[in-house]
């Protein structure tokens, strides 16, 4: 691979409503399948065609579930995961970890089980500075014509 | 992608036995549901068999229950069915299928949508 490659992270809370068919999608991951290298979380592995994760839209294949209705995901076995997700009733509410791929340099490619990433902060605050330079010197410009 | 290959086909006499292998792709196979099909001539595809990730729960179609095993080894990315006391009705083709990780709905193993990834099939001929 060349160049490296990184990943904005996000958090978001994810309410779903079990449909006829369940929420529909699957999992990896537990302290007995370490999908990720040095992870034992739990990741989507799967989002079935409109079942309703899809439905909903914002869940997507590769995100980390950090909880269930509340309850975290930390330290599980992949069995009592998805035993977790079973038995979590109607209303099922997700904290769910989004990563973002960045390009930086030349071709990357996201291995599968690999999603080691960066704080969006690392992004964002460089961002915001470059933007307040920016709109600084335009505002110097103006005063000068 | 994850690729399936099958093997281990062949032409059997009835009481005879195969043992069928999948082979797949994939640096997180350990994390497979895997399942056998099968389809005869003019025949919809039947489910034989399926295994969970870690080999410690499989699935049976009845009329295989008994005589087929299912079994996979994760050092060596392969599924396995070993038939033993083939019968003529057993002759079709044989379909290994995939799907990454464990659904969190209830898991009906003989649902081919259940699968993401399918083989080419490998000819069983019980005479």
């Known amino acids: 691979m060349n160049g490296r490659v990184d990943y904005l992270v996000t958090e978001e809370e994810i309410n779903l409503t079990r449909g006829p068919s369940g929420l529909g999608f699957n999992i990896v991951g537990g302290t007995d399948q370490q999908y990720v290298s040095n992870d034992s979380g739990i990741y989507v592995s799967r989002i079935k065609e409109n079942g309703a994760a899809a439905l909903d839209g914002r869940l997507q294949e590769g995100d980390k579930i950090l909880s269930v209705n509340g309850q975290d995901l930390k330290n599980l076995l992949h069995q009592d995961a998805v035993d977790l997700f079973r038995n979590a009733g109607y209303a099922v509410s997700l904290r769910v970890q989004h990563r973002l791929q960045v390009q930086n340099g030349p071709i990357g490619h996201r291995g599968e089980g690999d999603p080691s990433g960066i704080p969006i902060f690392m992004v964002l605050v460089p961002v915001f500075a470059l933007t307040m330079v920016a709109a600084w010197a335009f505002m110097r410009y103006r005063q000068q014509l | 992608d994850v690729q399936l290959v099958e093997s281990g086909g062949g032409l059997v006499q009835a009481g005879g036995s195969l043992r069928l292998s999948c082979a797949a792709s994939g640096r997180t196979f350990s994390t497979y549901t895997l399942g056998w099909f099968r389809q005869a001539p003019g025949k919809e595809r039947e489910f034989v068999a399926a295994?969970?990730?870690?080999?410690?729960?499989?699935y049976y179609a009845d009329s295989v229950k008994g005589r087929f095993t299912i079994s996979r080894n994760n050092a060596k990315n392969t599924v396995y069915l070993q038939m033993n006391s083939l019968k003529p009705e057993d002759t079709a083709v044989y379909y290994c299928?995939?799907?990454?990780?464990?659904?969190?709905?209830?898991?009906?193993?003989?649902?081919?949508?259940?699968?993401?990834?399918w083989g080419q099939g490998t000819q069983v001929t019980v005479s």
């Open positions: 295994i969970n990730w870690s080999g410690g729960t499989t």
């Open positions: 299928a995939a799907v990454i990780g464990s659904t969190v709905d209830s898991y009906d193993p003989g649902d081919p949508l259940e699968y993401d990834y």
